[in-house]
Interface confidence: low
């Protein structure tokens, strides 16, 4: 159903070894990053905090899908994680490594 | 070519009549809203100001397209336009109607 496929936050566990970041990130071995998945169909729900441009684009797409692409479901709020990492060969504790995990998704 | 299909700002003219907004927007009849089109493939170009999360998501997608969707090409900076509109039957001038036109695109 369309509602089930609507823009929302879904789990995405990142294993640093898998992406080759274990060479400099010591801990944690991975983290829950989440991702934003789903469609942004008109009318755009309020909780997806659409910009005016996104509303207009979704509306144009609804009327003529050739003219404009759909608005896109993307992270609108990101949170930090704390990591231990190597900096010039020295282990460093990064208290807040910003922009790593999705806390909110929206239509843009 | 992949570079030509990369995330960038493309023209999108909005005709207020087409989307039914001419009922309250008196002028202009339309405006250049632009839209963001194209792919966000790893490695993400610096001018697309990717977040760390977008970089990681693009990298995971590159390694396993089933595990994560691509990062998405969306407006990262919007600009206002000036409009004349009807407010309770009174023609009103709005000097800055925010968030209407794309000035920059990026990968999120």
């Amino acid at each position: 159903n369309a509602k089930g496929n609507y823009c929302k936050r879904t789990p995405l566990y990142i294993d640093f070894k898998e992406i080759g970041w274990d060479s400099w990130i010591i801990a944690p071995p991975g983290y829950e990053a989440y991702e934003c998945r789903g469609v942004c169909n008109y009318p755009l729900a309020e909780h997806l905090t659409p910009t005016k441009h996104a509303i207009i684009q979704a509306l144009v797409h609804l009327k003529n899908s050739q003219k404009a692409s759909k608005a896109c479901c993307v992270p609108t709020k990101l949170e930090p994680i704390s990591i231990l990492y190597l900096d010039k060969g020295v282990v460093t504790y990064k208290f807040k490594y910003e922009g790593m995990a999705v806390s909110e998704c929206g239509c843009r | 070519n992949a570079k030509g299909n990369y995330c960038k700002r493309t023209p999108l003219y909005i005709d207020f009549k087409e989307i039914g907004w001419d009922s309250w927007i008196i002028a202009p009849p339309g405006y250049e809203a632009y839209e963001c089109r194209g792919v966000c493939n790893y490695p993400l170009a610096e001018h697309l100001t990717p977040t760390k999360h977008a970089i990681i998501q693009a990298l995971v997608h590159l390694k396993n397209s089933q595990k994560a969707s691509k990062a998405c090409c969306v407006p990262t900076k919007l600009e206002p336009i000036s409009i004349l509109y009807l407010d309770k039957g009174v023609v009103t001038y709005k000097f800055k109607y925010e968030g209407m036109a794309v000035s920059e695109c990026g990968c999120r």
Epitope: I26, A27, P28, I81, S82, L84, L86, G89, V90, V91, T92, Y93, F95, K96 | -
Partner: antibody
Framework: QVQLKETGPDLVQPTQTLDITCTVS????????VHWVRQPPGKGLEWMGT???????DYNSAFKSRLAISRDTSKSEVFLKMDSLQTDDTAKYFC?????????WGQGIMVTVSS | QFVLIQSDSMSTSAGSTVKLSCKRS????????VYWYQQHEGRSPTTMIY?????PDGVPDRFSGSIDSSSNSAFLTINDVQIEDEAVYFC??????????FGGGTKLTVL
């Protein structure tokens, strides 16, 4: 299961050297980091230093050059060595495991500095 | 280098809510995470809150962490206080260069 156990002397003479061993089990010292923290009687916690899993060491500058932390990964042991002890070094000395946060502590060893 | 200031002691009654504070003397409380430890008399500390507001497994959800930038303080809130919550609570944060800074601790008495 994860365990940390501090062993060493109960009593040290002023100006002498303190040697404490933290023996760990249930995890590898090349995966997790180990803190040394002390607590004088009736007082708060004081971080002394950390043995990082990669072999690097960080010290609290308050201990200047008096403190040395080392390890023997094959024996799963981390060592604390502190010189020139004074009576105000009387404290309970803890080792603790740091992963994403400090999740396990040893029971601590009470060391009295007195003649 | 900053210090973390905690009140020496607090009293509360069982079943009530208590909010322990941890004020950073200089610099922004939000610039690095705050951790909270509980220590019962004669025991080793245990982590109650990490990364400012996250609870390790096994820590009751009666315990929560928060920060308030206007007072430059971190808080540990304990709802529905139990007798077994009587302990000393330490906050901890970081100064630059991976220095682990502890507050002086607050002794919580449950009446």
């Amino acid at each position: 299961q994860v365990q940390l156990k501090e062993t060493g002397p109960d009593l040290v003479q002023p100006t002498q050297t303190l040697d404490i061993t933290c023996t760990v089990s249930g995890f590898s010292l090349t995966t997790y980091n180990v803190h040394w923290v002390r607590q004088p009687p009736g007082k708060g916690l004081e971080w002394m230093g950390t043995m990082w899993n990669g072999g690097g060491i960080d010290y609290n500058s308050a201990f200047k050059s008096r403190l040395a932390i080392s390890r023997d990964t094959s024996k799963s042991e981390v060592f604390l060595k502190m010189d020139s002890l004074q009576t105000d070094d009387t404290a309970k000395y803890f080792c603790a495991r740091l992963g994403y946060y400090v999740d396990y502590w040893g029971q601590g060893i009470m060391v009295t500095v007195s003649s | 280098q900053f210090v973390l200031i905690q009140s020496d002691s607090m009293s509360t009654s069982a079943g009530s809510t208590v909010k322990l504070s941890c004020k950073r003397s200089t610099g922004n409380i939000g610039s690095s995470y705050v951790y909270w430890y509980q220590q019962h008399e004669g025991r080793s500390p245990t982590t109650m809150i990490y990364d400012g507001d996250k609870r390790p497994d096994g820590v009751p959800d009666r315990f929560s962490g928060s920060i308030d930038s206007s007072s430059n303080s971190a808080f540990l809130t304990i709802n529905d206080v139990q007798i077994e919550d009587e302990a000393v609570y330490f906050c901890q944060s970081f100064s630059s260069g991976i220095k682990f800074i502890f507050g002086g601790g607050t002794k919580l008495t449950v009446l």
